[in-house]
């Protein structure tokens, strides 16, 4: 009491850092610093992040919370997880759509847009890999269809149509003229 030197940070526990005159306990995630502690090893005055803002980590210096991001509707993004006091909104794509990164070196924070997944069924193909982080990977033609050019063509239903070699192998027809 009555001294003039501010104390060194030798408080019990490791979550004290110097803020101004004193070593203070920081604010937990989801809270911002309203005022630093007023005595050695004291608790700072921390307030909960207001709605639509967040702070993900314990902190000693943030006097305001970060604004939650809004998912980009123009890019067909949707909120997979709503923003909370401790975590930002997690944006992604709705079922049946996949993430297409807008930069070549893609990381989790990279800008992206959502693309509709290929519908293998509509292309008369097997689904080899379901669409999630990348587009659907379609496989071979469904039964009753054969490879022709880039697509799957329906097996002829009568002997009147022509059935090339690949058709014959799949559809069980010999080539007819």
């Amino acid at each position: 009491q009555g001294g003039t030197r501010s104390p060194r940070c030798d408080c019990a526990g490791d979550f004290h850092k110097k803020i101004g005159l004193f070593c203070c306990r920081g604010c937990p995630a989801g809270h911002y610093l309203k005022a630093p502690c007023t005595e050695p090893c004291g608790n700072s005055t921390c307030l909960v992040c207001p709605q639509d803002t967040f702070l993900a980590w314990e902190n000693h210096h943030n006097s305001e919370c970060a604004r939650c991001q809004a998912c980009d509707e123009q890019a067909s993004q949707v909120a997979l997880e709503n923003c909370s006091a401790v975590a930002d909104t997690r944006c992604g794509c709705k079922p049946g759509w996949f993430v297409e990164c807008q930069v070549s070196q893609c990381v989790s924070s990279s800008p992206f847009y959502c693309q509709p997944c290929l519908d293998c069924g509509a292309l008369h193909r097997h689904t080899r890999l379901l669409c999630s982080r990348r587009d659907t990977d379609c496989g071979t033609c469904l039964p009753g269809f054969y490879e022709h050019g880039d697509g799957c063509v329906s097996c002829p239903t009568s002997t009147l149509g022509s059935c090339p070699e690949r058709c014959a192998a799949v559809c069980g027809w010999r080539q007819m003229f």
Partner: antibody
């Protein structure tokens, strides 16, 4: 709106005593450290004393140590400075100020004159 | 005690001028430095805390920079209402200490 209003200043003879008060409003007084800062006529600012939010920790400038006592009453939202054994060099405007790292709000000041 | 050396002690400038005041601490104070404006007969007003953070409502022509021992306060374009005395103050350590002030006047 944060407001700090000092009172209790006046003229006193050397060796005399005065008690300054600072009435706080517009904020949660019990969450903030408070200080007294003074300014002699035509001079710069000089920090005098500091008290923690709970009143449990007090600090003083060497020039007033042993003569001045800082205290607070959180129930009354009030800060005090008891000044004893006053000297001519204590003549100044005395400001109370709220500590939030820096001193972000100040009162208008009260003049203390120590003269025979 | 940490000694705060402010310079110049007074300066005269014209409206629109860029004005710079410096403050030097006798030891490292990190960024625990504030700047105040005091007009005659009034209480000091906090302009900048943590060396560079502008207080809410303070015009953007005021700015601060520096850390450690050397700090600068700048008014980018002097206005008539900026006539005042400016003080730096450290709050890294007790006792809290102020610079001796810089009196700013209009030419």
């Amino acid at each position: 709106e944060v407001q700090l209003v000092e009172s209790g200043g006046g003229s006193v003879q050397p060796g005399g005593s005065l008690r300054l008060s600072c009435a706080a409003s517009g904020f949660t007084f019990s969450s903030y450290g408070m200080s007294w800062i003074r300014q002699a006529p035509g001079k710069g600012l000089e920090w005098v004393s500091y008290i923690s939010s709970s009143g449990g920790h007090t600090y003083y400038a060497d020039s007033v140590k042993g003569r001045f006592t800082i205290s607070r009453d959180n129930a009354k939202n009030s800060l005090y400075l008891q000044m004893n054994s006053l000297r001519a060099e204590d003549t100044a405007v005395y400001y109370c100020a709220r500590y939030s790292g820096a001193f972000d709000h100040w009162g208008q000041g009260t003049l203390v004159t120590v003269s025979s | 005690d940490i000694v705060m050396t402010q310079s110049p002690s007074s300066l005269s400038a014209s409206v629109g001028d860029r004005v710079t005041i410096t403050c030097q601490a006798s030891q490292d104070i990190s960024n625990y430095l504030s700047w105040y404006q005091q007009k005659p007969g009034k209480a000091p007003k906090l302009l900048i805390n943590d060396a560079s953070n502008l207080e809410t409502g303070v015009p953007s022509r005021f700015s601060g920079s520096g850390s450690g021992t050397d700090f600068t306060f700048t008014i980018s374009s002097l206005q008539p209402e900026d006539i005042a005395t400016y003080y730096c103050q450290q709050y890294d350590n007790l006792p809290i200490t102020f610079g001796q002030g810089t009196r700013l006047e209009i030419k």
